[in-house]
């Protein structure tokens, strides 16, 4: 999971205002137990800061110690700062918790850059703006780290919401969500609405603004418009899905669909960008460049390393194409597509020199570990992680940033043959994309 490239936060732009929650009629299948349509206590429970992820408030221990925890669907450990660190305002103090139990086992998690290590234990955990339950969960108490915590990010730990297969040190360490479902009546499902601001926010705006919602145990119908479309979870490790086609402004990239999923495609709230395999990235950039050729952008921009700016309020959104990813559907030979706007893949960046310009980074980047559908994708949609039925749902988010001409979309069905062939069969190795 990659932190440090995106503040996805919303402050009232685009879509219905978050404060307005109207019940809607829906033509969806009948709801299962626990999937009621309103979760008022959980709506707006996420906050975030640019490039630094979305976090939820959690409490650990007895008496409860409050911490902000990064919501990460690309990893599977619940890990919290448990020792003083220059970037932490607060940390988990195990010695103050009467319910802490030491597992007498260490854990070491190296990343492409940086690492964290700590001591495993269990304690009582709850989510104040979540279900009204307390669970005993595994906690990695981080005692040492390098380039993990982010200065000013306002989070002190990470909640890995993926499956046990990628938990560290091994798959015997039960992830938090598994513990939650086992110990309570919370249905085996959660949903995320990540709300991008569409403009950079300073520290005080971040703390005062809403970043989105994590609905634990259900689906809140006020958070999306239209229908939810589901794609199968290919394998329960990361939230792995299969992309069957990619279009730029309706033009098919015409690549062998295996390339789109080489070596996997995952949905990861802890990554900022839409990350694409090298060949796919190069083809996509070539197509986006061609579509936006009325303006010439610096080479560094397409690498995500250089800003482009326009006079405030004059960003020419219309010259940039929409990007559609077709995902395998639940029915044989059926797919659906999710479409994002430049408002999602051009990331607003604070320009320290002047407020007269709106500046952006290109938030699509190259990957050597497959496609990562990070915040760039997720900010367009309400995403349902339906673990019980081994599927992920997408609907247009009520808070996505758009303009008067175009909106993000989830559309289907489309006939697509031989979709199973699009999946790549990865050689078995112990790998994790944590922070890559």
């Amino acid at each position: 999971t990659q932190h440090g490239i995106r503040l996805p936060l919303r402050s009232g732009l685009g879509g219905a205002p978050l404060g307005l929650r109207l019940p809607r009629e829906t033509d969806e299948e009948p709801e299962e137990p626990g999937r009621r349509g309103s979760f008022v206590e959980m709506v707006d429970n996420l906050r975030g800061k640019s490039g630094q992820g979305y976090y939820v408030e959690m409490t650990v221990g007895s008496p409860p110690q409050t911490l902000n925890i990064l919501v990460d669907t690309g990893s599977s450990n619940f890990a919290v700062g448990a020792a003083p660190h220059p970037f932490l305002h607060r940390y988990y103090q195990r010695q103050l918790s009467s319910t802490y139990r030491d597992l007498r086992k260490g854990v070491y998690v190296p990343y492409t850059q940086g690492k964290w290590e700590g001591e495993l234990g269990t304690d009582l955990v709850s989510i104040p703006h979540g279900p009204n339950v307390t669970v005993r969960a595994n906690i990695a108490a981080i005692t040492e780290s390098d380039k993990f915590f982010i200065n000013g990010s306002n989070w002190e730990g990470i909640l890995g919401l993926a499956y046990a297969e990628i938990a560290r040190p091994d798959d015997s360490l039960e992830p938090f969500f598994d513990s939650l479902v086992k110990q309570t009546h919370v249905p085996n499902l959660f949903s995320l609405q990540l709300c991008g601001a569409g403009f950079p926010l300073n520290q005080s705006e971040v703390l005062a603004s809403v970043g989105g919602s994590m609905i634990i145990g259900g689906i809140d119908h006020s958070l999306y418009t239209g229908s939810l479309w589901y794609t199968p979870i290919r394998r329960e490790w990361y939230y792995e899905v299969i992309i069957v086609r990619v279009e730029i402004n309706g033009q098919d990239l015409k690549m062998d669909c295996k390339e789109y999923n080489y070596d996997k495609s995952i949905v990861d709230s802890g990554t900022t960008n839409l990350r694409l395999p090298k060949k796919v990235f190069e083809a996509a950039v070539k197509s986006i460049k061609a579509a936006s050729s009325t303006e010439k952008f610096p080479d560094g921009f397409w690498l995500g390393e250089q800003l482009v700016c326009w006079q405030a309020g004059t960003t020419p959104w219309n010259i940039f194409p929409v990007i559609s990813l077709y995902l395998m559907g639940e029915v044989t030979n059926q797919s659906f597509r999710i479409t994002i706007l430049p408002q999602q893949y051009l990331r607003p960046v604070e320009d320290v020199a002047t407020s007269q310009d709106d500046c952006y980074k290109f938030a699509i980047s190259q990957s050597s570990t497959g496609t990562v559908m990070g915040a760039v994708i997720m900010e367009g949609f309400y995403v349902v992680f339906d673990r019980a039925r081994k599927r992920i749902g997408f609907a247009v988010s009520a808070c996505h940033v758009h303009d008067e001409f175009r909106t993000a979309a989830v559309e289907g069905p489309f006939v697509t043959l031989d979709m199973e062939d699009c999946g790549y069969n990865i050689p078995q190795t112990d790998e994790s994309t944590l922070m890559t």
Epitope: G4, K147, K296, P298, G304, E305, Q306, V349, S365
Partner: antibody
Framework: EVKLMESGPGLVAPSQSLSISCTVS????????VDWVRQPPGKGLEWLGV???????NYNSALMSRLSISKDNSKSQVFLKMNSLQTDDTAMYYC???????????WGTGTTVTVSS | DIVMTQTTSPLSVSLGDRVTISCRAS??????LNWYQQRPDGTVKLLIY???RLHSGVPSRFSGSGSGTDYSLTISNLEQEDIATYFC?????????FGGGTKLELK
């Protein structure tokens, strides 16, 4: 405070290779690119190449065949390697931190490389 | 490659002068033009980035302007410490390139 410090061999024999390191502090190599620039005695600045925050590299087209730039993010070091040195590669070699507008906003003090037998 | 051509060097100046150094690119560089100062001791500093933005800590007597292929650096009231060599640099297209430099010399 952002700092960059080059360190090189000083003297290199013709046809041999050059290795220079640039140790940085005050910023993360995963967030910002680092460029290499050289200046032969009494001449102007010549751009050699860049290693981007994301890890990709680009080079001066005239030198691409014998130039290689790499980095170690965890050690905050950037490396320049150049093969088959000739006397006209004698120069002051600088590393510089890149900003998000394509400017090189902090430079190292440079390291002198003399190619001579 | 984009070729950057600077004002002929050296340039004879007097303290207190308003000095303008020009730089021409062989193709449109969309304002991704930077100016650097190199002191006689070899120290290089960024002065102006993105055509006209003053780098932090740089005195306000330095300014930049231009668009397309033509750019300039102006020092409004030349001081002794400004006697140095100035380079333009395009940050638009890889491979990035520098101008040949303009050395200021006191008359």
């Amino acid at each position: 405070e952002v700092k960059l410090m080059e360190s090189g061999p000083g003297l290199v024999a013709p046809s041999q290779s050059l290795s220079i390191s640039c140790t940085v502090s005050g910023f993360s190599l995963t967030s910002y690119g680092v460029d290499w620039v050289r200046q032969p005695p009494g001449k102007g600045l010549e751009w050699l190449g860049v290693v981007w925050g994301g890890g990709s590299t680009n080079y001066n087209s005239a030198l691409m065949s014998r130039l290689s730039i790499s980095k170690d993010n965890s050690k905050s070091q950037v490396f320049l390697k150049m093969n088959s040195l000739q006397t006209d590669d004698t120069a002051m070699y600088y590393c510089a931190k890149r900003d998000y507008f394509g400017g090189l906003n902090v430079w190292g003090t440079g390291t002198t490389v003399t190619v001579s037998s | 490659d984009i070729v950057m051509t600077q004002t002929t060097s050296p340039l004879s100046v007097s303290l207190g002068d308003r000095v303008t150094i020009s730089c021409r690119a062989s193709q449109d560089i969309s304002k991704y033009l930077n100016w650097y100062q190199q002191r006689p001791d070899g120290t290089v500093k960024l002065l102006i980035y993105y055509t006209s933005r003053l780098h932090s800590g740089v005195p306000s007597r330095f300014s930049g302007s231009g668009s397309g292929t033509d750019y300039s650096l102006t020092i409004s009231n030349l001081e002794q410490e400004d006697i140095a060599t100035y380079f333009c640099h395009q940050g638009h297209k890889i491979p990035y390139t520098f101008g040949g430099g303009t050395k200021l010399e006191l008359k």
